[in-house]
């Protein structure tokens, strides 16, 4: 014959365990129901009554099949280097997440606990390595016959453009300048090839202000040259 | 105030080990890029080794290069130097340093007071 | 490597003196270049950066010039505090390395 289904509550088998979405409660010593996700355990078993589950309130969520007394908080809000990539409900905590142009320096188990602008690499320096969502970016030195001439966090060292005839010499920081506008070979897009001023020293493009300070941040900290802006998310 | 604090040198013997750890306060530690920076008794300064603030970057001095390790522990507002195969020529104060940012601000801003490494039998 | 080619080696000069120290780098390194001051028996201590930019709280009396392979560190009135030794180092490619120093005296 098929055993006999049991509800809830019911007392276990010797050495049995509950089933599944079912916990045993030491006072009542019986196996009970747990809440769904989005709910907890307003009332707890006893020997003759099932849990009883309520919807968890405002700002409040269960991800997980439980029997908490209370709902867990969601995080507070994101801040401003962050986006909320997901939105508090009541299954489910509110996850924030770098906004574009910075990466988590700090993982939390969930989202971000400290956000930092992606460094830009300077004239002279590319992209060896792009950043990620948890990596920043890895700049390198422009090799002979490249250049940057940019402030980015996404631009790599271009090659060259070849000339008939080199009228300024190309270096890491700029690109060569012919003296006629067709040079021989099809230039990397972006590449000068009309005569400019020269300036042999890499020029930037963001304010640099003494830079033995921390990373600007978004308690609004000083900003160094280039060390990156910091933010930080409430727990 | 950012502060660094260097600890784990002393004496030790030609091919030994010895493990230096710098303690960082003052600052986002997982955001900067730090280095160590060596001075033998009464000579200049020698870059010994970079790790970027992910710690996925690293780089060493040639004289180093395979003997060293630097890592760091972004958890723990620390960065270390494991020196393996000691020689004479390593005894040196070994300074930990921040910076560079490197490929956008290229240079050392603060310092660590120092600590002191002897490689003699 | 790229080389550092710091000069002089050792100085002496008066309070009031204008002090000039030189670095010349084995190929351009594009001003990626910090000048330190270190005193007996204490850390370096950053006073340029860039090869012309005054690092936070240095006295303007320091100052930097130069660009490719040639840079400059000047002192334009020697004070008592600033008798110490001067390094430069280059950011370009490893290894970074520092100038042998500039040892300034009093005379």
């Known amino acids: 014959l098929p055993a006999q289904v049991a509800f809830t509550p019911y007392a276990p088998e010797p050495g049995g365990t509950c089933r599944l979405r079912e916990y045993y409660d030491q006072t009542a010593q019986m196996c009970c129901s747990k809440c769904p996700p989005g709910q907890h355990a307003k009332v707890f078993c006893t020997k003759t009554s099932d849990t009883v589950c309520d919807s968890c309130e405002d700002s409040t969520y269960t991800q997980l099949w439980n029997w908490v007394p209370e709902c867990l908080s969601c995080g507070s809000r994101c801040s401003s280097d962050q986006v909320e990539t997901q939105a508090c409900t009541r299954e489910q905590n509110r996850i924030c997440t770098c906004r574009p142009g910075w990466y988590c320096a700090l993982s939390k188990q969930e989202g971000c606990r400290l956000c930092a602008q992606l460094r830009k690499c300077r004239p002279g320096f590319g992209v060896a390595r792009p950043g990620t969502e948890t990596s920043d970016v890895v700049c390198k030195p422009c090799a002979p016959g490249t250049f940057s001439n940019t402030t980015s966090s996404t631009d790599i060292c271009r090659p060259h453009q070849i000339c008939h005839v080199v009228a300024i010499p190309g270096n890491a920081s700029m690109d060569a300048v012919c003296t006629s506008t067709s040079p021989t070979r099809s230039m990397a897009p972006g590449a000068v090839h009309l005569p400019q001023p020269v300036s042999t020293r890499s020029q930037h493009t963001q304010p640099t202000p003494a830079p033995s300070t921390a990373p600007g941040t978004s308690f609004l900290l000083p900003v160094g040259p280039s060390p990156p802006a910091e933010g930080s998310t409430g727990d | 105030e950012v502060q660094l604090v260097e600890s784990g040198g002393g004496l030790v013997q030609p091919g030994g080990s010895l493990r230096l750890s710098c303690a960082a306060s003052g600052f986002a530690f997982s955001t900067y890029d730090l280095s160590w920076v060596r001075q033998a008794p009464g000579k200049g300064l020698e870059w010994v080794a970079y790790i970027n603030n992910g710690g996925i970057s690293t780089y060493y001095s040639d004289t180093v290069k395979g003997r060293f390790t630097i890592s760091r522990d972004n958890a723990k507002n620390t960065l270390y130097l494991q020196m393996n195969s000691l020689r004479a020529e390593d005894t040196a104060v070994y300074y930990c340093?921040?910076?560079?940012?490197?490929?956008?601000?290229?240079?050392?801003?603060?310092w660590g007071q120092g600590t002191l490494v002897t490689v003699s039998s | 490597d790229i080389q550092m080619t710091q000069s002089p080696s050792s100085l002496s000069a008066s309070v009031g003196d204008r002090v000039t120290i030189t670095c010349r780098t084995s190929e351009s390194i594009y001003s990626n270049l910090p000048w330190y001051q270190q005193k007996p028996g204490k850390a370096p201590k950053l006073l340029l950066y860039?090869?012309?930019k005054l690092a936070e709280g240095v006295p303007s009396r320091f100052s930097g010039s130069g660009s490719g392979t040639d840079y400059t560190l000047t002192i334009s009135s020697l004070q008592p505090e600033d008798f110490a030794t001067y390094y430069c180092q280059h950011f370009w490619v490893t290894p970074w390395t520092f100038g042998q120093g500039t040892k300034v005296e009093i005379k």
């Open positions: 860039d090869a012309t």
């Open positions: 340093v921040r910076g560079p940012f490197y490929g956008s601000a290229n240079y050392f801003d603060y």
